[in-house]
Interface confidence: low
């Protein structure tokens, strides 16, 4: 516990004039001047009516104001003569005296009131010396402390009852105890009076010291009956931007150049790389110009920057598709969350006067266009004989924080002529016992002027193929067997060569006994 404080309500040691307490009967206690152990002059009371039996001598102090105190302590200094050392005394000689108190709301006592007896006076204790003395000049001073309470009225009197002792009351001090204001767990607790009983625990509410915050509530400390603090409950801790100092009684602001991101008892730390503070009490260090923190970065992480451009972009064009490959940037910006984006631009016009615009949505990127972790991408569905610019951007977790666009490396390419794409679905317009009339849509991507179409067909049961060429996107196949199934495929041709065949489709000729041609039969997929 912490040191207890004692506050005096009354102390005879400092009284130099008469005490003028009330004694009853007047032949009992007598006020005399004397000296304390340090030979300072003091006022004392003595009684020594030992040769007379049936003594009942009372002494009452002046009125003592209570000051909201619930329990009062009385320190008595006295000497007692050893009954055996006094000649010619009856057996009623005592070596003890009694301590009483009486509560009142004002100074109402008189020579006859309250009545000189236990009840109305409240007995505190019978006081016995540790040592009595046999010779008048060799008196040993006894010191005794007693307490009483709870008190409720405005003040009280102390009273001393002698029943036949030879003694001197050297000093009387009435005081109370309180717990001194203290700092514990970064919280301040005020000076607090002790409770009504020696075992009482008085709750003192706490407040966090400056620059501290509560970490557990409620904040309280208990003041015990001896004026000592015990059982702390709750605690504060230094707020962000502050560190413990002066044996945990202060929270000191972090000096410039340091910070503390979390509340607690940890110290301020130097700013992480690429950051600084310009004022004290920083909970985070601000990033240097062109350095940033991502939203997911903690306050104690270094500030980082955007990556430099990718290096060594290589293109490998194959007709209307290409593969781009590149190397890692020289500078990753201090981060490990590097990604790549590939921006496609289609260019029109010649040389330096060309204008470029974003590519069409049908351009395909494998594995993807944005957020690549790989340093390779396959790009297809480009237009033939067209100039393109591809920008390979390097980005990381702070690219979105930078006001500047991502850094990139660009490569210019021109596509070659490509063969036409696949012919879509074939349709049957009519069939007879010996012929099939078919049509089809041109390829989605002709990649040039279509010169003609080649059709491959065979009877399903035989598998020997025949071919026929058509300048139009329809054809009539003649000389077929009746009631037979035929598998048909078509492909388109440009100057770049043939495209891929369409998917195989099945059609049937009609029976010879049928009544003419059957119209618009749907294709039968394999």
């Amino acid at each position: 516990g912490c040191r207890a404080l004692e506050e005096t309500l009354m102390d005879t040691k400092w009284v130099t004039s008469e005490l003028a307490w009330t004694s009853h009967p007047e032949s009992g206690w007598e006020e005399v001047s004397g000296y304390d152990e340090a030979m300072n002059p003091i006022r004392t009371y003595q009684v020594c009516n030992v040769r007379e039996s049936s003594q009942n001598n009372w002494l009452r102090t002046g009125f003592i104001w209570r000051r909201d105190v619930q329990r009062v302590y009385v320190e008595l200094k006295f000497t007692v003569r050893d009954c055996n050392s006094i000649p010619n005394i009856p057996g009623s000689c005592k070596e003890t005296f009694n301590l009483f108190y009486y509560e009142a709301d004002s100074d109402v006592a008189s020579a006859s009131s309250p009545f000189w007896m236990e009840n109305p006076y409240v007995k505190v204790d019978t006081i016995a010396p540790d040592e009595s003395f046999s010779r008048l000049d060799a008196g040993r001073v006894n010191t005794k402390v007693r307490s009483f309470g709870p008190l409720s009225k405005a003040g009280f009197y102390l009273a001393f009852q002698d029943q036949g002792a030879c003694m001197s009351l050297i000093s009387v001090r009435a005081f109370y105890k309180k717990c001194a204001s203290t700092t514990a767990g970064f919280a301040l607790f005020p000076e607090t009076l002790t409770g009504a009983e020696p075992t009482s625990l008085v709750i003192a509410p706490g407040t966090c010291i400056p620059n501290a915050v509560e970490v557990s509530v409620p904040l309280k400390l208990y003041c015990n009956g001896d004026g000592e603090w015990m059982v702390p409950v709750g605690a504060c801790t230094c707020a962000t931007g502050h560190e413990p100092a002066a044996k945990e009684s202060q929270c000191r602001p972090c000096p410039p150049g340091s910070y503390k991101a979390k509340q607690g008892e940890g110290p301020c730390l130097p700013c992480p790389p690429n950051s600084r503070t310009t004022s004290p009490a920083a909970s985070i260090c601000t990033c240097h110009n062109n350095f940033y923190r991502a939203d997911s970065d903690s306050a104690d992480s270094a500030c980082t920057t955007v990556p430099s451009p990718p290096r060594g972009v290589i293109s490998n064009v194959n007709e209307t598709s290409l593969i781009l490959e590149w190397s890692e940037p020289r500078d990753l910006g201090g981060r490990d969350d590097l990604l790549y984006n590939v921006i496609c631009k289609k260019c029109h016009g010649a040389g330096g006067a060309s204008a470029c615009s974003r590519c069409d949505d049908n351009v395909e990127f494998v594995p993807r266009q944005l957020g690549l972790t790989e340093r390779r991408v396959h790009i297809s569905h480009l237009l033939a004989h067209t100039r393109y610019t591809f920008e390979v951007q390097a980005v990381n977790g702070v690219s979105g924080k930078s006001p500047l666009p991502p850094r990139y490396a660009a490569v210019n390419i021109t596509t070659n002529q490509a063969a036409p794409s696949e012919v879509p679905t074939l349709r049957l317009h009519s069939s007879s016992g010996s012929s099939l009339t078919l049509s089809w849509a041109p390829p989605e991507r002709p990649n040039g002027v279509i010169l003609d179409y080649e059709m491959k067909y065979f009877e399903k049961s035989e598998g020997i193929a025949s071919t026929v060429t058509s300048q139009m996107n329809s054809v009539q196949l003649d000389g077929l067997r009746p009631d037979a199934r035929y598998v048909v495929q078509v492909r388109a041709r440009t100057v770049a060569g043939y495209g891929q065949y369409s998917r195989p489709a099945e059609f049937e000729t009609t029976s010879e006994r049928g009544s003419g041609a059957q119209q618009l039969q749907e294709q039968l997929p394999l």
């Epitope: 970490v215 707020a239 979390k262």
Partner: antibody, heavy 121, light 112 residues
Amino acid sequence: EVQLQQSGAELARPGASVKMSCKASGYTFTSYWMHWVKQRPGQGLEWIGYINPSSAYTEYNQKFKDKATFTADKSSSTAYMQLSSLTYEDSAVYYCAREGKYGSYYGLDYWGQGTSVTVSS
Amino acid sequence: DIVLTQSPLSLPVSLGDQASISCRSSQSIVHSNGNTYLEWYLQKPGQSPKLLIYKVSNRFSGVPDRFSGSGSGTDFTLKISRVEAEDLGVYYCFQGSHVPWTFGGGTKLEIK
């Protein structure tokens, strides 16, 4: 006084989407993260994820990654959660809850009254 | 995912009794920063959950001191020293140390 006021009950068909709101008052909306919690009828609580209204940074429970989308409107101090491709399993009460911090995290300290979602054909 | 197992599922008590609820995690829930983000919530019938305890043993503002939390690593306990009528409901433990954050299955505190 801190308050989180959630939007009213929703009735939706399987496959549809719903978007519920959580309006914050009594504190600085952008200073505290907002969490979402699911409670099926008569069941326990399930954490869906959270959003930082200041930066729109989100973190989802993987289980709800394709189900829930969090957004926040700083001007109206309102957090939103959209649930998509609803199934009967999504019928539940959904709570928004503020993540308390006083220098450091101390729990989900204030909760909305909940929005009931019923999926029925 | 970390699984929090609460026991018992149901806890019948008399008013004034002490109640104790256990919460066990499938692995340690000490965060890399050294804190243990284990909380306790109470959900009364027809109401939203309310925070009681955070970081294992810290009582949230306004929570009576008859509620106390303890434990470390994987074993945690909520104690109510003298149960009052207003304490009845379902108690959930919750960990916020590792994503996804998870709740325990709940313990229903009811009158015997």
